[in-house]
């Protein structure tokens, strides 16, 4: 809390400028008039004020709004929206997509801080919608939002905006996340040639079906065994012995140390194990020689 | 994270010059601006002079004419030359940086100047 003193003769700030940098923090709270500031928040953000001082400035604004920023006040924050708390912005009522963008350019190239996340859900809930608009903002700040969304939200995600994603920021999609994401990151990666687009479309094969599998095996992708354990299960699992090896390429040789995981351990169960033989890993488990394999579903699905 | 080492302060008389300089290291892809600061003694710290990213500068007026803040980006160093230099300019200077989501201060060097 700064101090309540009276403003030193001829201080009184008549306009938000420059001179202000060169007064301390009591002569902020002495002399500058909330009002004042309000009206000329949108010079703030081109001063260069100490965070020291954007306190002050943010000291007198919460005086003058106690239940919360206009959106007119909001959109001219700029840095001082690093001196929000949560609390703070749950107070706004935010319906505009520029001062959503104008605040998250404040935070850009770092982490979504707890304001961020904060300012958002505010302005998600202010909405009613997650619209395409919104989504594409979102995503061109935070490619990692994507994995914070359910897959009902997803599916409003345009393909366009699957370009700006990175490997490490579907590190926390779960698979029905994932289910939703790779048909639109195929499609937007359909026109690239086959090692260019594997290695776009790797992050996202946890939502690959077997068929897509299949076709990969066939491009010499080489996929590692990282990527190869993220795959679904029942995408798995209806992959032979070759089309797994012609999958791995050279790092075939990396499931005998996965062989107790899932999906290899389900994909082992269901082959043959001469099949598994011919990898030469020593794989075991497979279905013995002789036996006859009955496909339950298929018959099912027939009757 | 931003570090601050300031150097290059001393004892000098009336008249004379001095050259203070800031060695700035960590995330100083952060910063937004940086600025010498000084706290005489009994004092209130107060600042001395500004100089943004794009080289903006901004002078107190009891040093205007006298002190020119610069820097070297391909050192990150701040700089400060105090030229005429008076009794009343006898303080610590703290060298500051204002960076992603906060200010960063050295640990300051004490300026004396006496005859």
């Known amino acids: 809390e700064v101090e309540k003193t009276a403003c030193p003769s001829g201080k009184k700030a008549r306009e938000i400028d420059e001179s202000l940098i060169f007064y301390k923090k009591w002569e902020l709270e002495a002399c500058v008039d909330a009002a004042l500031l309000a009206t000329q928040m949108d010079r703030v953000n081109a001063i260069p004020f100490t965070y020291e001082q954007l306190d002050v400035l943010k000291h007198k604004l919460d005086e003058l709004y106690p239940q919360g920023y206009p959106e007119s006040v909001i959109q001219h924050l700029g840095y001082l929206f690093l001196k929000m708390s949560p609390e703070d912005i749950r107070k706004w009522n935010v319906t505009s997509l520029e001062t959503l963008k104008a605040l998250l350019e404040v935070n850009k190239g770092h982490e979504m801080s707890p304001q961020v996340a904060t300012l958002i859900d505010r302005f998600v809930k202010g909405r009613g919608q997650l619209d395409k608009d919104t989504l594409d903002t979102l995503t061109a700040f935070y490619p990692g939002y994507l994995c914070s969304l359910s897959p009902e939200e997803l599916s409003s995600v345009p393909p366009s905006s699957i370009w700006a994603v990175r490997p490490q920021d579907l590190d926390t999609c779960d698979p029905r996340q994932l289910d939703v994401l790779y048909p639109k990151a195929r499609l937007a990666f359909q026109n690239m040639n086959g090692s260019e687009y594997f290695v776009k479309i790797q992050s996202f094969l946890g939502g690959a079906p077997t068929e897509d599998l299949k076709a990969l095996s066939q491009q010499n992708v080489s996929m590692d065994l990282a990527t190869f354990m993220k795959l679904r299960t029942d995408a798995v699992l209806p992959l032979t012995v070759a089309e797994v090896q012609k999958l791995l390429g050279p790092h075939v040789e990396g499931l005998k140390a996965e062989e107790r995981h899932r999906p290899v351990r389900d994909w082992i169960l269901r082959q043959r194990q001469d099949d598994l033989d011919t990898l030469g890993l020593g794989l075991q488990g497979g279905i013995p020689n002789g036996y006859l394999v009955l496909d339950l579903s298929m018959q099912e699905a027939l009757s | 994270e931003v570090q601050l080492v300031e150097s290059g302060g001393g004892l000098i008389q009336p008249g004379g010059s001095l050259r203070l300089s800031c060695a700035a290291s960590?995330?100083?892809?952060?910063?937004?601006?940086m600025g010498w600061h000084r706290q005489a003694p009994g004092k209130e710290r107060e600042l001395v002079s500004t100089?943004?990213?794009?080289?903006?500068?901004y002078y107190a007026n009891f040093v205007k004419g006298r002190f020119t803040i610069s820097r070297d980006n391909s050192k990150n160093t701040l700089y400060l030359q105090m030229n005429s230099l008076r009794a009343e300019d006898t303080a610590v200077y703290y060298c500051?940086?204002?960076?992603?989501?906060?200010?960063?201060w050295g640990q300051g060097t004490l300026v004396t100047v006496s005859s």
């Open positions: 500051r940086a204002t960076a992603h989501p906060t200010d960063y």
């Open positions: 960590g995330n100083i892809g952060s910063i937004r601006h």
């Open positions: 100089i943004t990213t794009v080289g903006t500068t």
